[in-house]
């Protein structure tokens, strides 16, 4: 019928799959007067023929890999065979079936990795190539690990990328390989092309012999370095190496000290550059990096851990200029009088910090010289021969001496002698009432003021009232504070008040002395006074038992996860509703009823994490009050986005033509998570085609470099394809395009004429 | 062997036509197209048109339409070219050509020709 | 139409001498499609019908001499008779069949001195 098989001459295309003997006409072209007979040129390969009629056909079967497309013109002459119409082109696509297997490069190939190498880093690459098409199955290979000898406890060191045949260690092979152990390994590496899913897919095998070397790239022992050495500086105290020469060694400071006092040079010997002082930090950690050329990180960081050692260099020190303590004076022979307390900047539990505390002198020595004597190791100063007289001598002067291994210092005690405390506080009231409060009074309120006397000798600890709710507030809701002058009580809330669970307290404050009470005399009844407190009611929001919560979960959790859970109370009993708030991403939704939250959407890192909502509470009836609280959800990184490139590379180009063989730098990035060592990307050409004239070779994880590998080009823009592996699990390849433009210069500048100016290339090379 | 015979002299009054016919052998007539030229004395060449009788698909030269018209006869294997309302200015030699080209040739040229035939218009 | 100007109209050589005539066409003869040019060579000696030369302006028929070359190609068109002898005593028309109507130069009248 016309359109499909048959038709006017136009420019067409045709697909025709290769390995098929024919069975149908291509394709029945109609001639409009006055051609009479039609003409077939270009890449025919004396199979493609065409009848004078118009009749387009193929003779045999056609085969992909020795054209994929063949471009054909069709001509329609006159009787004079001149022509009238065309030549139009009519391209035939050799459409690929898989009739070619993949073959490795080699029947054996060689590597070494050492152990402890970063998992996943590619240490040896497979490589295999199939003449079928590699934008079908046909031609998509699949590499996989067989068999790895020896097999230790059924554990794989090795992992294989299935796509790029790339050999690195897995997790387990990072940290159990031991050349001391096994030094060597093999594997059986085998392709498969239809990506490995086809049972009728194609196969090849290879074997991989694998040597372990020894990693010296190791932390060295925790170092002790003595404190204010007097020796030298700079002093070595270690030393890191890594495995080939050429590292460039530095120090990483992870706690910013803003004196840093070591330093690496570039054999990975490490120095402390000035004497340390214990006292102002007793211990440092910091980090050994070993980096390439481009500065880029060869490993992970060592940790150093640097102890100071104490050396006696400081002298006790009194707690203040005059320590005073108060002693009745009936007070009984051994009675303590107070603690002495003096301290040391040495380091604790050391013979350096170990204190001896002895009396030197004592003033007056009145009734005697001896009436104290003090603790030898803990301080505590007791009356030693009598009871003093407030008459006689009011007040004692003493002089101790407080020392360490090395030094002495000399403190001073002042001891007031004081009246006996025989008198007890006394309240003026012994119940102070009712007192209403809505329970949402604020913190900090004075609501209640109390008074109790003491007749004993004003300013002292025997006159001193000290009030304490001994009653009804086991919460401790509420506090006392009381006016040295005056001996007031200030009644404050300290806690906020609850009508839920305390409407009504009976509250009972005893009043006492700090100095005890002589003997025979005893708190009495007068000590004490109560009071009531009553709490009105106040309709509270819900209230969330954390301000905020948090969870962590992989970004790639299936739709439909619990991700984390949110609890609320409300004071007055009622059921609680929970609703999310600040969803934009549509990413969450709450269970109204318990709180839970769950993933309704494909969650993103790379969008931003933490993920910040909030949850709210509200009561359900009542007056339905709610409160917020923040929900942080933190998402672990999973290697979902394919490498790309860093910036926009349009506008290189070369000046034409090349005197010499050029080349560019370019970098790529990803949007996943990189820790210390940032990503580790392998770069290669996006298709075999670009072999002949580009070349790419990788610099560091980041950059490579592409290279013309001769001048013969033509002056136009070339699009070079780029493969780009992030060596991740699972790994991800982008392929990206890399626009170069070959174009006559001008002082060094890309020439357009006038009328041109559009795309101008900006970067020569 | 290819022949292209054509037929004798004629001598016509102005106003008048004439026929002139190319008889062919040699070759199957339909492949190829016939061509018919002028020669006036001591003159070059006009190219008038050709016939292509497998179809007959005639082509003029704009200068000949309404002067020529080419025919053929398929059974007979013969060409023909009538000249009507002559004048003295179509007194000329007329020589008919076989073009090489047919389907799967390249041969691109006149390679047999007729011998000529004189038309003389004289009153 | 295209216009096909042949020069010299005439000229006389002695045998064995290098004779070069020209053509030259209105316009292009080159077929961007194939490359080629549309143009024949041919030599009509006394009291005979033309025969053919070179076709494709630079292709020589098969039992022509060697002696008779044809080049140029788009506009500009020679017919080199390397060595003559007596028997090239004709007149040599080129002639464009890149469009209709085809046309022939006026001639070049080869004579023998």
């Known amino acids: 019928q016309e359109g499909k098989f048959s038709g006017p001459l136009k420019p067409m295309t045709f697909s025709i799959y290769e390995g098929q003997e024919p069975s149908q006409i291509i394709f029945q072209f109609k001639a409009n007067p006055p051609a009479v007979t039609f003409e077939l040129t270009g890449e025919t390969d004396n199979i493609f023929v065409i009848e004078r009629e118009g009749l387009l056909y193929y003779n045999r079967a056609l085969d992909r890999e020795t054209r994929s497309t063949h471009n054909l013109q069709v001509a329609a002459l006159d009787a004079n065979g001149i022509i009238v119409e065309g030549p139009v082109p009519i391209t035939i696509k050799v459409k690929d079936i898989n009739d070619n297997r993949p073959t490795f490069l080699q029947s054996k190939y060689e590597g070494s990795v050492r152990q402890n190498s970063r998992p996943g880093k590619p240490f040896l690459y497979v490589n295999a190539t199939d003449l079928d098409d590699p934008a079908t199955p046909n031609g998509q290979l699949y590499y996989q690990i067989v068999i790895q000898l020896p097999m230790i406890n059924n554990v794989m060191y090795f992992q294989i990328n299935n796509k790029t045949g790339a050999i690195s260690l897995t997790r387990e092979g990072s940290q159990e390989l031991n050349p001391a152990k096994n030094p060597s390994y093999n594997l059986v590496i085998s392709v498969k092309d239809m990506g490995g899913q086809s049972e009728n897919s194609f196969s090849d095998t290879t074997s991989v012999d694998i040597i372990v070397t020894e990693n010296i790239w190791k932390a060295p022992k925790p170092v002790e370095m003595v404190e204010n050495s007097t020796d030298p500086h700079p002093i070595k105290i270690t030393q890191v190496r890594w495995n080939d020469p050429g590292a460039q060694y530095s120090l990483v400071d992870k706690e910013k000290l803003p004196r840093f006092p070591f330093s690496i040079d570039q054999e990975g010997d490490i120095y402390v550059t000035q004497p340390l002082d214990r006292e102002e930090k007793d211990a440092y950690v910091f980090y050994a990096v070993a980096k390439d050329e481009y500065g880029k990180p060869l490993s992970y960081p060592l940790e150093i851990h640097v102890k100071v050692k104490d050396i006696n260099d400081n002298p006790p020190t009194c707690p203040s200029p005059v320590t005073v303590f108060e002693v009745q004076e009936n007070e009984r022979l051994g009675n303590s009088i107070g603690t002495l307390t003096a301290h040391d900047r040495d380091e604790e539990n050391t013979a350096n910090s170990f204190l001896n505390y002895r009396i030197v002198e004592q003033t007056p020595k009145l009734p005697m010289d001896g009436l104290f004597l003090i603790q030898t190791y803990a301080g505590m100063l007791q009356l030693a021969k009598q009871s003093l007289k407030k008459q006689d001598t009011p007040q004692y002067n003493l002089t101790i001496e407080v020392s360490d291994k090395d030094f002495k210092t000399l403190c001073f005690v002042q001891i007031n002698v004081i009246d006996i405390n025989d008198q007890i506080p006394i309240f003026e009231k012994s119940d102070y009432g009712n007192l209403t409060l809505a329970e949402d009074t604020n913190i900090g309120s004075t609501i209640l003021t109390i008074q109790a006397t003491d007749a004993d000798e004003p300013f002292t600890g025997s006159s001193k009232i000290l009030y304490h709710i001994i009653k009804g507030d086991s919460e401790g809701r509420l506090g006392v504070d009381t006016d040295p002058h005056t001996n007031t009580g200030y009644v404050i809330i300290k806690k906020p008040l609850d009508f839920e669970t305390a409407a009504v307290s009976n509250i009972v404050f005893k009043a006492e002395n700090p100095e005890p009470l002589v003997f025979g005399v005893k708190y009495n009844a007068s000590s004490f006074a109560k009071f009531t407190l009553i709490v009105t009611d106040v309709n509270e929001a819900p209230q969330f038992s954390q301000h905020v919560f948090q969870a962590k979960v992989s970004e790639d959790v299936a739709i439909g996860t619990k991700v984390g859970n949110v609890t609320a109370k409300d004071p007055e009993g009622l059921d609680i509703s929970y609703s999310l708030r600040g969803d934009t991403r549509g990413w969450l939704k709450i269970d109204h009823v318990t709180g839970e939250i769950f993933s309704v959407a494909p969650l993103d890192r790379e969008a931003g994490s933490p993920y910040r909502v909030q949850v709210v509470a509200t009561e359900v009836g009542g007056s339905s009050l709610s409160s917020v609280s923040e929900f942080h959800l933190i998402l672990m990184d999973v290697n979902d986005n394919p490498p790309r490139l860093a910036k926009d590379y349009t506008g290189l180009f070369f000046c034409h033509p090349l005197s010499a063989p050029g080349s560019l730098i370019f970098e790529a990035t990803d949007d996943d998570q990189h820790l210390f060592r940032g990503p580790h990307f392998t770069f290669s050409l996006g298709s075999g085609s670009l072999q002949n004239d580009w070349e790419v070779s990788k610099i560091n994880g980041t950059h490579a470099r592409l290279s013309t590998r001769h001048t013969e080009f033509e002056e136009r823009e070339y699009v070079v394809l780029i493969r780009i592996n992030d060596g991740g699990r699972p790994p991800l390849e982008g392929i990206v395009s890399l626009p170069v433009t070959f174009c006559s210069c001008v002082e060094g500048s890309c020439f357009r004429p006038a009328g041109h100016q559009t795309g101008i290339p900006t970067v020569g090379m | 062997q290819v022949q292209l015979v054509q037929s004798g002299a004629e001598v016509k009054k102005p106003g008048s036509s004439v026929k002139v016919s190319c008889k062919v052998s040699g070759y199957t007539f339909t492949d190829h197209t016939i061509h018919w030229m002028k020669q006036r004395p001591g003159q070059g060449l006009e190219w008038i048109g050709y016939?292509?009788?497998?179809?007959?698909?005639?082509q003029y030269n704009e200068k000949f339409k309404g002067k020529v018209t080419l025919t053929a006869d398929k059974s007979t294997s013969t060409a023909y070219m009538e000249l009507s309302s002559l004048r003295s200015e179509d007194t000329a030699v007329y020589l008919c050509?076989?073009?090489?080209?047919?389907?799967?040739?390249?041969?691109?040229?006149?390679?047999?020709w007729g011998q000529g035939t004189t038309v003389t218009v004289s009153s | 139409d295209i216009v096909m100007s042949q020069s010299p109209s005439s000229l006389a050589v002695s045998v064995g001498e290098k004779v070069t005539m020209s053509c030259k066409s209105s316009q292009s003869l080159l077929h961007s499609s194939n490359q080629k040019n549309y143009l024949a060579w041919y030599q009509q000696k006394p009291g005979q019908s033309p025969k053919v030369l070179i076709y494709w302006a630079s292709t020589r028929e098969s039992g022509v001499p060697d002696r008779f070359t044809g080049s140029g190609s788009g506009t500009d068109f020679t017919l080199t008779i390397t060595s003559v002898k007596s028997e090239d005593l004709a007149v040599y028309y080129c002639q464009q069949y890149y469009s209709y109507p085809w046309t022939f130069g006026g001639g070049t009248r080869l004579e023998i001195k």
């Open positions: 016939i292509y009788p497998r179809d007959v698909i005639t």
């Open positions: 050509a076989r073009w090489g080209y047919f389907y799967g040739s390249r041969s691109y040229y006149f390679d047999y």
